[in-house]
């Protein structure tokens, strides 16, 4: 999906008012310095591409983030503010249902959510130069 035509300010507002605290709660008990940010993004569409990938695509050691509250809210926000997103996701969801996994919080998942927090911070500050 091409995130170029999303309403970025509306997604930012959704993140600040409904998603950010759920990411913090997920990470509760871990130090903010515990994980290095290894995933970056260069502009808002790129950030959303990376956010979607980390949130919804199972990775080795962390297969369950898509079932977390912050993931559901992210999915809902993208569907509302990115034209055509919901249509492109329907087929992907049918495939996901076939490999539904139970929610497990692993260190790998914590690291992944830490990366997500960094991507969202970057998304919210699009005028900052890339480090």
């Amino acid at each position: 999906y091409d995130f170029t035509n999303c309403d970025f300010e509306k997604i930012k507002a959704a993140y600040l008012s409904t998603i950010s605290k759920d990411l913090i709660t997920y990470m509760s008990g871990t130090k903010s310095t515990e994980f290095n940010n290894t995933v970056s993004c260069s502009n808002r569409p790129h950030c959303l591409t990376e956010i979607q990938s980390l949130t919804f695509n199972p990775t080795a050691g962390c297969a369950s983030l898509a079932k977390e509250m912050f993931a559901m809210k992210t999915k809902a926000a993208l569907a509302i503010w990115c034209p055509g997103y919901s249509e492109t996701q329907i087929n992907a969801t049918q495939a996901m249902k076939k490999r539904r996994k139970r929610k497990v919080t692993t260190n790998k998942c914590l690291e992944q959510v830490s990366q997500l927090q960094g991507l969202w911070r970057r998304f919210n500050r699009p005028l900052l130069k890339q480090q």
């Epitope: 709660t25 999915k75 569907a79 969801t93």
Partner: antibody, heavy 117, light 107 residues
């Protein structure tokens, strides 16, 4: 303007079935997470069920296995199929748009379901 | 999973400040929303994201959430604020949960 209109409520005997419908207008229905919330006479609000644009569904424990939520995005309509109805299911049923899988920003006017013999 | 506890009733004199609490285990780690419901009407969202007001909601409505308690505050309460108020949050099982409701009486 943004509107949700429920229909299908009425009197039904215990053990019976009923199907509620909710017609949505004024917004891109196919993009939103939609829910049913009920309110028994003189009681508080109880969330019943919700459904994503892609058909992913969620249910309250009290209705799991008896109620089925569905949607037809081409008709901008939300449904609630209620089977094995009990007296405690008697309530006003509200169709609701649940913004960001989270808070309800638009409510219908409600439709009354009475389960009684 | 989380249960939300509200006082059944709160009374306030016109012009005074009304505070309605909503308690739940580690509630501060979740977002809380507040609805106003008048007799015979559907509920209306008055606070979302703990403390944000939807457009059209008067400034006298405010919200806070920390620890195990969220609070809806109505400053300079008016007669028209008399209604039932419900808090709402969500569970770890991805379901929506409401408090039992509080009847606000303006004396």
């Amino acid at each position: 303007q943004v509107q949700l209109v429920e229909s299908g409520g009425g009197l039904v005997q215990p053990g019976g079935s009923l199907r509620l419908s909710c017609a949505a207008s004024g917004f891109t229905f196919s993009s939103y997470y939609m829910s049913w919330v009920r309110q028994a006479p003189g009681k508080g609000l109880e969330w019943v069920s919700g459904i994503f644009f892609d058909g992913t569904t969620y249910y309250a424990d009290s209705v799991k296995g008896r109620f089925t939520i569905s949607r037809d995005n081409s008709k901008n309509t939300l449904y609630l199929q209620m089977n094995s109805l009990r007296a405690e299911d008697t309530a006003v049923y509200y169709c609701a748009r649940q913004q960001y899988f989270d808070h309800i920003d638009i409510w219908g006017q409600g439709t009354l379901v009475t389960v009684s013999s | 999973d989380i249960e939300l506890t509200q006082p059944p009733s709160v009374s306030v004199a016109p012009g005074q400040t009304a505070r309605i609490s909503c308690g739940g285990d580690s509630l501060g780690g979740k977002y809380v929303y507040w609805y106003q419901q008048k007799p015979g009407q559907a509920p209306v969202l008055v606070i979302y994201g703990d403390s944000k007001r939807p457009s059209g909601i008067p400034e006298r409505f405010s919200g806070s959430n920390s620890g195990n308690t969220a609070t809806l505050t109505i400053s300079g309460t008016q007669a028209e604020d008399e209604a039932d108020y419900y808090c709402q949050s969500y569970t770890n099982a991805l379901s929506t949960v409401f408090g039992g409701g509080t009847k606000l009486t303006v004396l």
